[in-house]
Amino acid sequence: TSSASSSSSSAPFLASAASAQPPLPDQCPALCECSEAARTVKCVNRNLTEVPTDLPLYVRNLFLTGNQLAVLPAGAFARRPPLAELAALNLSGSRLDEVRGGAFEHLPSLRQLDLSHNPLAYLSPFAFSGSNASISAPSPLVELILNHIVPPDDKRQNRSFEGMVAAALVAGRALQGLHLLELASNHFLYLPRDVLAQLPSLRYLDLSNNSLVSLTYVSFRNLTHLESLHLEDNALKVLHNGTLAELQGLPHVRVFLDNNPWVCDCHMADMVTWLKQTGVVQGKDRLTCAFPEKMRNRVLLELNSADLDCDPILPPSLQTS
């Protein structure tokens, strides 16, 4: 039993103890604000270059935003005793460019992780699984927020960014319990095949503000719990029958498709027919054509088959440059 004392402090500039004694388990790290009652530690906009070592054991919410962490090594949050209560970890905007395998190991209660707005040139395949085993121990993560983690072009690795992120999501099947995944604003051109198959518990998937051109090779079939699918602000031209059927087969889903450059030609007929009868698409009356020029700004729901034609393909001999 502890009596109430100054085990937490809002004073952000508490100096570390000068003596060689280990820090008190519930003291507040320098450059941080702490509330034991709120189980929260905020080390925000302090230009920290590493994770504080003397985090209080009570911490459930840890904000390390707006710092200069650069690299998150293996065991970055491993402590003795462990931070057994830590449930929400926000590392957004901390100039991370490398997250190594096992970075989040020894956090048995970690439910929510936000790595948004970090230019991740390297995300280890084992960042979330913690090991290179083909089947890892399940991660406790329920929410994983990875918005705007794409690095600048000059910092990209040789392999595709999409592939790097996908490898981390599927490694060891560790994220089978994930309910929420945000991947907005990452310049994704495609979604690697089979990623979603490894995330069967997803309820919320945000892929908005990417550069997705097609969903042809993406399977939503086993996402039977999916409630929200955000595909706004991509480069989608049309959704084909296979995708339409899969989305229609999901019992709870709501799909958001605003601000895509829909191509209203003969290939759009099935999607228009589907839109007219489905309850799956939110704001479907706002969807408009972007191409061809003659169809620009036409509302998809108002089109009929006569509107959706394709220019005949001319034989080579008749084509002109």
Epitope: S2, A4, S7, S10, A11, S35, A37, A38, R60, Q112
Partner: antibody, heavy 125, light 107 residues
Framework: QVQLVESGGGVVQPGRSLRLSCAVS????????MNWVRQAPGKGLEWVTF????????YNADSVKGRFTISRDNSKNTLYLQMNSLRAEDTAVYYC??????????????????WGQGTTVTVSS | DIQMTQSPSSLSASVGDRVTITCRAS??????LAWYQQKPEKAPKSLIY???SLQSGVPSRFSGSGSGTDFTLTISSLQPEDFATYYC?????????FGGGTKVEIK
């Protein structure tokens, strides 16, 4: 629905003991941290004591330290306040209050989000 | 211990009035502050947490502001059901402490 029901209040002489109970229903008691808060007649609110969801952490106000003990029985969905060496100044309505944090919750701390209706303790000779 | 001082201790106002209650902490508490409403013979009800975040279900006429040592609860347009006593509470550190309360009465 979520409900906290206090009991065990009454009139007691100074120096004697009393045990308050708070029966919980409508949520997973074993996942939530809990508090006792009191209010003397015509006065403001005073936090008394806190216990974590598993009983591993307890905190007391200086005014009750060494006299009051908070405990819980998760199998019975019940929170307790053992009050010894009672004084006249302990006369108050005693509320049990749920902390908004649960073991599985991540996100903002909302303070004490659910309160019981209170039980009255009168310490008088 | 952190002392919380509320002012005024009571005020009279009419329906439709804008009401402001202040709370001062004896030392910096960042934004670790909650506001509660209590009606006679009833348990307190949580209104605001983290100094300015509205609890679910609380009308938007209630708002909170401040950080560090000085905080404010504002009711933009007082309604009949808002006549009550309001308490601030710090949760920067244990022991948790409440302000002395502000009773809002009908003018």
């Amino acid at each position: 629905q979520v409900q906290l029901v206090e009991s065990g209040g009454g009139v007691v002489q100074p120096g004697r003991s009393l045990r308050l109970s708070c029966a919980v229903s409508g949520f997973t008691f074993s996942s939530y941290d809990m508090n006792w808060v009191r209010q003397a007649p015509g006065k403001g609110l005073e936090w008394v004591t806190f216990i974590s969801y598993d009983g591993s952490n307890k905190y007391n106000a200086d005014s009750v330290k060494g006299r009051f003990t908070i405990s819980r029985d998760n199998s019975k969905n019940t929170l307790y306040l053992q009050m010894n060496s009672l004084r006249a100044e302990d006369t108050a309505v005693y509320y049990c209050a749920r902390d908004s944090y649960s073991r599985s919750w991540y996100g903002d701390y909302y303070g004490m989000d659910v309160w019981g209706q209170g039980t009255t303790v009168t310490v008088s000779s | 211990d952190i002392q919380m001082t509320q002012s005024p201790s009571s005020l009279s106002a009419s329906v439709g009035d804008r009401v402001t209650i202040t709370c001062r902490a004896s030392q910096g508490i960042s934004s670790w502050l909650a506001w509660y409403q209590q009606k006679p013979e009833k348990a307190p009800k949580s209104l605001i947490y983290a100094a300015s975040s509205l609890q679910s279900g609380v009308p938007s006429r209630f708002s909170g502001s401040g950080s560090g040592t000085d905080f404010t609860l504002t009711i933009s347009s007082l309604q009949p059901e808002d006549f009550a006593t309001y308490y601030c509470q710090q949760y920067n550190s244990y022991p948790l402490t409440f302000g002395g309360g502000t009773k809002v009465e009908i003018k």
